[in-house]
């Protein structure tokens, strides 16, 4: 595969990663698919410094990140360990709230208006952030 050495047009470089900030909304799964089609993933926040960078760019708007517990435990989409990693939940979150009346609980994480995280219904059409790492060889599957 070929290595990506600079960010694509309309993406923002920061600390050897590239970020793309949507300006419209999709459900979490659709946002996840969008990032994958860009050979990227929903943003994975690994430090307070990265949190501040993303928060600065998204402003006070609900925005999906690459964290969910749709299969039980909380997981980052790129395999980053959740338990030992950076977290920035709002107080008393995540709460898997069932009181919204939309069926089920809350399985997808988003940045709230103050940047701290909340779990919410994955079908809500929030903005999202894609991330891809520079110097990472793109995995091109062999042609059969």
């Amino acid at each position: 595969g070929s290595e990506r050495t600079c960010c694509p047009v309309n993406w923002v470089e920061h600390e050897r990663s590239c970020y793309w900030f949507s300006r419209s909304g999709k459900a979490w799964a659709d946002a996840d698919n969008y990032c994958r089609l860009e050979d990227a993933h929903l943003v994975v926040v690994t430090s307070w410094e990265e949190q501040k960078f993303v928060q600065h760019h998204i402003g006070p708007v609900n925005t999906w990140m690459g964290l969910h517990d749709q299969n039980g435990p909380w997981k980052w989409v790129d395999g980053t360990d959740y338990e030992t990693g950076f977290k920035n939940w709002r107080p008393e979150q995540p709460d898997d709230w069932y009181g919204h009346g939309l069926g089920g609980g809350e399985d997808c994480a988003h940045f709230t208006d103050d940047g701290r995280w909340n779990d919410d219904v994955c079908q809500r059409p929030y903005r999202w952030v894609c991330e891809t790492e520079l110097d990472k060889a793109s995995q091109e599957p062999p042609l059969l």
Epitope: S24, N33, R36, P141
Partner: antibody, heavy 118, light 107 residues
């Protein structure tokens, strides 16, 4: 000039196989997600499949899942569609199309006809 | 799957007429909608993306509007080369789906 050129269509019997190709030029192929869209005779458009720029991610319409495989060779700027277990209802003109960042199809090939008949 | 319904299925109009085509989604798709023009024997051509953005090279007589579930393609003054079939496409979620098409014919 930005261009997509499909080839590989033809007449095939039900249950048979065919591989379509789409040669791209005039844009950065390796960073563009690519699609196949088909149109049965006298009918509307049906999206078939998409593949990310690296080839690492694919998605299919339910009507072709498990029978069709989308792939690409970025060294040759070429997109492929391997079609197996073909059915009469797969008869259509097959277009390759480039995806833009708003998930619309901004560049189209001229199409190649696939006829499935005994 | 998200279903897209266009109306009318065909329209007869004269050069210079204002033509409006509507597209309705059976669920909210925000602004994730595109419009295409197709002439017989040819590939579709992108006219409008993100509901209201005019594709580069497309005449300004074409415009798109709407969000949520209801969308409109307007041709402000029909030209001879505009007689064709028009399709909407939702890009909100997989599988991406098209409307059934609207044929604009000469009156």
């Amino acid at each position: 000039e930005v261009q997509l050129l499909e080839s590989g269509g033809g007449l095939v019997q039900p249950g048979g196989s065919l591989r379509l190709s789409c040669a791209a030029s005039g844009f950065t192929f390796s960073s563009s997600a690519m699609n196949w869209v088909r149109q049965a005779p006298g009918k509307g458009l049906e999206w078939v499949s998409v593949i990310s720029g690296s080839g690492g991610y694919t998605y299919y319409a339910d009507s072709v899942k498990g029978r069709f495989t989308i792939s690409r060779d970025n060294s040759k700027n070429t997109l492929y569609l391997q079609m197996n277990s073909l059915r009469a209802e797969d008869t259509a003109v097959y277009f390759c199309a480039k995806r833009n960042t708003d998930d619309a199809f901004d560049i189209w090939g001229q199409g190649t006809m696939v006829t499935v008949s005994s | 799957d998200i279903q897209m319904t266009q109306s009318p299925s065909s329209v007869s109009a004269s050069v210079g007429d204002r033509v409006t085509i509507t597209c309705r989604a059976n669920q909210d798709i925000s602004s994730w909608l595109a419009w295409y023009q197709q002439k017989p024997g040819k590939a579709p051509k992108l006219l409008i993306y993100a509901a209201s953005n005019l594709q580069s090279g497309v005449p300004s007589g074409f415009s798109g509007s709407g969000s949520g579930t209801d969308f409109t393609l307007t041709i402000s003054s029909l030209q001879p080369e505009d007689f064709a079939t028009y399709y909407c496409q939702q890009a909100n979620s997989f599988p991406w789906t098209f409307g059934q098409g609207t044929k604009v014919e000469i009156k």
